[in-house]
């Protein structure tokens, strides 16, 4: 043999109970002591420090703290130094050293020592990770190193968590003993934060010890708080709230069209939109994610706004008889009432649509003119004017005539036409044609689609001449002999050389 000792590096005991510190030692065989003595020291191995003597085999003299509380269970002659401490109290917690005394110069304090921990709560061991939906084993362990008092274990607050299985007394690696009870159950998210307790009691004593552990159940997020669809007026302030329940707290992300707008590790996340515009109308998604899973929900934001100024597309110039199609469109929320007017007369209207198609089959000159497209909802009204130009061959109106006044003859040729025609006055009896370009004789005035050309003739009285008015544009020509009204005296002018 050689000098050496074996004892648990640490050992525990409940306050008020006892503890047996198992201990073996060895020494060289050739020392052959007649009697083996030993000393247990508290907290220091150096005799020079005068550490408290826990037990001494040579004498009954021990430190007052250990008076009547220490006894050697082992037989030193058999190299067993097992120590029993009774009625342990917190001040007895610390290091215990054994010193073998073989006589002569052979006294040896073993560096191996035992640290006694005085406890007053059972140790509830919960796995480092408890996940909802996955079976877990929770154990309650208490020291069982007192041969005189054996603990009995019971669970507290385990209702609905399964029936406990008592494993009984187990030997630990270093020779210490524990009493173990197991609880197997499948935790739910609701079990998070649940206080689970274990009670150690000692029969025939009033000693009772309780310990508790709060369950830290990990579970994936569930979004529990979310706006229903939101309507907001353009320019107003909008708050979108997303709240999730999870453990650990989730990473909450507000997204729109794949773009992250805001994110944070939190139980709830507010997305603030200042002065919303129609561009922010759409579907917003909240994503909640932790290591155990994810959840997502969406909310629609509807930004309410007055119609935009309508845009008008289509043919603005048409030939008489053609079909004209004009599209008036706008953007608003809600969709507007769209109306097309002409001279205060409603031509077409739609309710809650963003576009209005106006169809004019076989347009006539009467369709020519200014039109209005008006868009209106509860937030406002906007209008756009547009002109439709209907093109047609000249029409000589009935008010065309000639009239004499003293020494002058005036001929009016009134033409309705689009585009504007060229007008010529023909005097067949004189084989003369006067064009509108001859400003000395012809004066033209246009009002809308009506062109009035006036030919003024000066001269001596005579029988009235025949005057033919001809109007011409790209769609055709029309001629009319102008009727004469009033006196039959002709005042004529010589035209030309």
């Amino acid at each position: 043999g050689h000098w050496g000792a074996w004892m648990p590096s640490s050992i525990s005991a409940f306050e008020g109970t006892c503890v047996s510190i198992p201990c073996r030692f060895d020494f060289p065989d050739e020392l052959r002591p007649a009697v083996v003595h030993g000393v247990w020291y508290f907290n220091s191995p150096y005799p020079k420090n005068y550490p408290p003597v826990v037990f001494k085999s040579r004498t009954q003299v021990v430190h007052e703290s250990f008076q009547g509380r220490s006894r050697l269970l082992g037989d030193l002659g058999l190299r067993n130094c097992t120590l029993l401490l009774s009625n342990v109290s917190p001040e007895l917690g610390g290091k215990y050293y054994f010193r073998g005394d073989l006589g002569g110069y052979n006294q040896y304090t073993f560096s191996e020592h035992s640290v006694l921990d005085i406890v007053n709560t059972p140790n509830i061991v919960v796995p480092p990770e408890v996940v909802a939906g996955t079976e877990v084993e929770v154990s309650c362990m208490v020291p069982d190193n007192c041969p005189e008092l054996r603990p009995e274990l019971s669970w507290l607050g385990h209702e609905g968590l399964g029936e406990p299985a008592v494993l009984g007394r187990l030997r630990e690696d270093e020779g210490t003993w524990v009493q173990v009870s197991l609880l197997h159950f499948v935790p739910t998210r609701e079990a998070n934060g649940h206080r689970l307790g274990c009670q150690a009691s000692f029969p025939n004593t009033t000693l009772q010890f309780e310990g508790y552990a709060s369950m830290d159940v990990k579970y994936p997020p569930v979004i529990v708080e979310m706006n229903s669809s939101v309507e907001a007026i353009e320019g107003s302030h909008v708050s979108l709230l997303c709240g999730a329940d999870s453990n650990p707290p989730p990473l909450l992300t507000w997204m729109r069209d794949g773009t992250v707008l805001r994110e944070a590790v939190a139980e709830s996340l507010l997305l603030e939109l200042e002065e919303v515009t129609p561009a922010e109308d759409g579907v917003y998604a909240c994503l909640a994610e932790n290591a155990y899973g994810q959840d997502n929900r969406t909310v629609g934001l509807s930004v309410m706004y007055a119609p935009w100024k309508p845009t008008v597309n289509g043919t603005m110039v048409a030939v008489e008889g053609e079909t004209v199609s004009i599209l008036c469109s706008t953007q608003s929320n809600p969709d507007p009432i769209l109306t097309i007017f002409k001279e205060k007369q409603i031509l077409s209207t739609v309710i809650y649509e963003s576009e209005l198609q106006l169809e004019l089959p076989a347009v006539s000159p009467e369709d020519d003119g200014e039109y209005w497209c008006v868009a209106e909802n509860q937030y406002g009204q906007r209008a756009t004017a547009f002109n439709l130009s209907v093109e047609f061959a000249p029409v000589l109106l009935l008010e065309s005539h000639c009239a004499a006044a003293r020494d002058t003859v005036q001929c009016l040729c009134v033409v309705k036409s689009n585009p504007e025609p060229s007008v010529a006055f023909e005097l067949p009896s004189r084989n003369v044609t006067v064009n509108e370009s001859e400003r000395e004789f012809v004066y033209s005035e246009r009002s809308g689609l009506v062109l009035t050309s006036i030919l003024t003739l000066r001269g001596q009285a005579q029988a009235p001449p025949r005057v033919i008015c001809t109007a011409r544009n790209l769609y055709g020509a029309k001629s009319l002999e102008l009727p004469f009204q009033g006196a039959h005296r002709l005042m004529w002018a010589k035209i030309g050389p």
Epitope: W3, E30, P47, K48, G104, Y105
Partner: antibody, heavy 126, light 112 residues
Amino acid sequence: QVQLVQSGSELKKPGASVKVSCKASGYTFTNYGMNWVRQAPGQGLEWMGWINTYTGEPTYADDFTGRFVFSLDTSVSTAYLQISSLKAEDTAVYFCARNPINYYGINYEGYVMDYWGQGTLVTVSS
Amino acid sequence: DIVMTQSPDSLAVSLGERATINCKSSHSVLYSSNQKNYLAWYQQKPGQPPKLLIYWASTRESGVPDRFSGSGSGTDFTLTIINLQAEDVAVYYCHQYLSSLTFGQGTKLEIK
């Protein structure tokens, strides 16, 4: 040079006490253990035990427990042997003897007694 | 305890001759950890304290004449004095200091 000087002879009555001193010089007192050896008239040597002068811890041989006490006064490099309840059979010459000690942390190794005091005769007689 | 037995109890040797004293221990005094024999020899003259002659069974203490030598191992040991001188008359003790310290009963050496 190393010297161990013991106190003089003592004549004591049975039941009395005696205290024998051993003053050391010429070396570091706490580096050596101090032993006590008894020699009854015309008899051999009997080891009574020793005291660790560094720690103050005494060790008694099995036949010398109870009435025998080893003590120290390191300030004057002196060891003491006190015998109480003296008996006639305690009549003997008492020697102190030093022994080297080699320390290893909390433990040590003791060696042979190399220097002896001159001896103190204690006579117990009524 | 380890019992030390010396032989003879006494012997007479002529001056200049060799004296041999034996010592037997009841158990080995050889320490396995350092392979040393924890045995010493002392000389005690009348009215004087013992004087150390030999330790570790064979190592001579300083100042001791080389006429004195020790030998042996385990349980059997011998003290040899050659060229015996008149001042060598004394009682010789063997002593083990491995376990609880013990002495032999002593051997008385005289001049023949």
